[in-house]
Interface confidence: medium
């Protein structure tokens, strides 16, 4: 026990002596952050001049503070021990390590391309002012149906699977453990809406049945085709869309 205690003391003395010798050999090692070892003044520690800093001790020079000019603005002022930090002026956002570049913001529903901000193409969205347009969630992959359609700015909202919603279908899937017994208010509301729609549709059909002779067959076919046509989103099909057809220069939509 006494022997190991002696060893520890001896080691400590050696380390302390080494540190003292090192500081005698290199007085600069004593200079703290925020100072530099001034060779012109007999190696004494001088504070960093204005607009410069040293973040570590023992430095022989201070570094010039970063300047946030142009599109950059100061996020954190330079101090004697730390560099200034910049971010970007409104309308731009940071890119690169330490915000080395500023990139233009776009609107939600757009993405920045080589040619500036362009609208997201059909089937994609961007809910931020930066980043790229991402494809809408494919609800069917999770066995769900689309409850709310997607837009350029928002993803689709997935709802219960179509099987869950057909009145006569008996579901084989057991209910989720967390769900309380009985139907949720949303499901009941949905069934009521569905029943009402079915009744209205039936009424509409019967009315049309009697008027078909007067109006002619073509009109009837047209009415029944209409609801199933894909809606044309004119706002996304103009030249401003970031997607191009394959034969055009930009290439297709990356989904």
């Amino acid at each position: 026990m006494g022997n190991s205690c002696y060893n520890i003391v001896a080691t400590l003395l050696l380390v302390l002596n080494f540190e003292r010798t090192r500081s005698l050999q290199d007085p600069c090692s004593n200079c703290p952050a925020g100072t530099f070892c001034d060779n012109n003044r007999n190696q004494i520690c001088s504070p960093c001049p204005p607009n410069s800093f040293s973040s570590a001790g023992g430095q022989r020079t201070c570094d010039i503070c970063r300047q946030c000019k142009g599109v950059f603005r100061t996020r954190k002022e330079c101090s004697s021990t730390s560099n200034a930090e910049c971010d970007c002026t409104p309308g731009f956002h940071c890119l690169g390590a330490g915000c080395s570049m500023c990139e233009q913001d776009c609107k939600q529903g757009q993405e920045l391309t080589k040619k500036g901000c362009k609208d997201c193409c059909f089937g994609t969205f961007n809910d931020q002012k930066r980043g790229i347009c991402r494809p809408w969630t494919n609800c069917s992959l999770d066995g769900k149906s689309v409850l709310v359609n997607g837009t350029k700015e928002r993803d689709v909202v997935c709802g219960p699977s179509p099987a869950d919603l057909s009145p006569g279908a008996s579901s084989v899937t057991p209910p989720a453990p967390a769900r309380e017994p009985g139907h949720s208010p949303q499901i009941i509301s949905f069934f009521l809406a569905l029943t009402s729609t079915a009744l209205l549709f039936l009424l509409f059909f019967l009315t049309l049945r009697f008027s078909v002779v007067k109006r002619g067959r073509k009109k009837l076919l047209y009415i029944f085709k209409q609801p199933f046509m894909r809606p044309v989103q004119t706002t996304q099909e103009e030249d401003g869309c970031s997607c191009r057809f394959p034969e055009e220069e930009e290439g297709g939509c990356e989904l």
């Epitope: 010039i64 503070c65 970063r66 300047q67 000019k69 142009g70 599109v71 950059f72 002026t89 731009f92 890119l95 690169g96 390590a97 080395s100 570049m101 500023c102 990139e103 233009q104 993405e111 920045l112 391309t113 080589k114 980043g131 790229i132 930009e250 290439g251 990356e254």
Partner: antibody, heavy 127, light 106 residues
Framework: QVQLVESGGGVVQPGRSLRLSCAAS????????MHWVRQAPGKCLEWVAI????????YYADSVKGRFTISRDNSKNTLYLQMNSLKAEDTAVYYC????????????????????WGQGTLVTVSS | YELTQPPSVSVSPGQTARITCSGD??????AYWYQQKSGQAPVLVIY???KRPSGIPERFSGSSSGTMATLTISGAQVEDEADYYC??????????FGCGTKLTVL
């Protein structure tokens, strides 16, 4: 015409330091950002660092951050790379290259690229 | 983030050489092409996908479609034999090079 000439390469032991220089001529040096790019034997080109035209703002690749320091002396038309705590993986040909942008601080997003390069100087880190 | 290039491409003199570079950010970011002849400094031959610096022969052209950028040398000549590197930045602003394609003009 634009000319960039690197010097200061050589064989050095791991943990030691080396300082590379790049002498520029044929253009107004103080108007341009400058880069160092390196190429290890049989490997891809790797961007190392950039210093803006005014010498104040500097950025580094993660692989060299804290060990390498880029600097410039506009009065001497010279770019420097101080390399400390060198590792075997720092062995490469080091090129200095001019940034294409006339004034980096004009305040718009830019994609850096290099319009003129030097011939390179070989740094070998070996024990 | 990576830019992927074929290691080598071979053509006969007078033929068209095509060198590709693929990267996920290329639909949004420009591609740049550098030529490096043995023992020499790299030379910029195409910038911003398809622009040619002054002094670069007209047979060099560039294009970009989707995630693929292409350097085309129409009527390749023996003196075009070199390593060709593509370069771009990724969506975070990091600077990235491809690993190069060795063009052989047989």
């Amino acid at each position: 015409q634009v000319q960039l000439v690197e010097s200061g390469g050589g064989v050095v032991q791991p943990g030691r330091s080396l300082r590379l220089s790049c002498a520029a001529s044929g253009f107004t040096f103080s108007n341009y950002g400058m880069h160092w790019v390196r190429q290890a034997p049989g490997k891809c080109l790797e961007w190392v660092a950039i210093i803006w035209y005014d010498g104040i703002n500097k950025y580094y690749a993660d692989s060299v951050k804290g060990r390498f320091t880029i600097s410039r002396d506009n009065s001497k038309n010279t770019l420097y790379l101080q390399m400390n705590s060198l590792k075997a993986e720092d062995t490469a040909v080091y090129y200095c290259a001019r940034d294409q942008d006339y004034d980096i601080l004009t305040g718009y997003y830019k994609e850096d690229y290099f319009d003129f390069w030097g011939q390179g100087t070989l740094v070998t880190v070996s024990s | 983030y990576e830019l992927t290039q074929p290691p080598s491409v071979s053509v006969s003199p007078g033929q068209t050489a095509r060198i590709t570079c693929s990267g996920d950010a290329l639909p949004k970011k420009y591609a740049y092409w550098y030529q490096q002849k043995s023992g020499q400094a790299p030379v910029l031959v195409i910038y911003e996908d398809s622009k040619r610096p002054s002094g670069i022969p007209e047979r060099f052209s560039g294009s970009s479609s989707g995630t693929m950028a292409t350097l085309t040398i129409s009527g390749a000549q023996v003196e075009d034999e070199a390593d060709y590197y593509c370069y771009s930045t990724d969506s975070s602003g990091n600077r990235v090079f491809g690993c190069g394609t060795k063009l052989t003009v047989l």
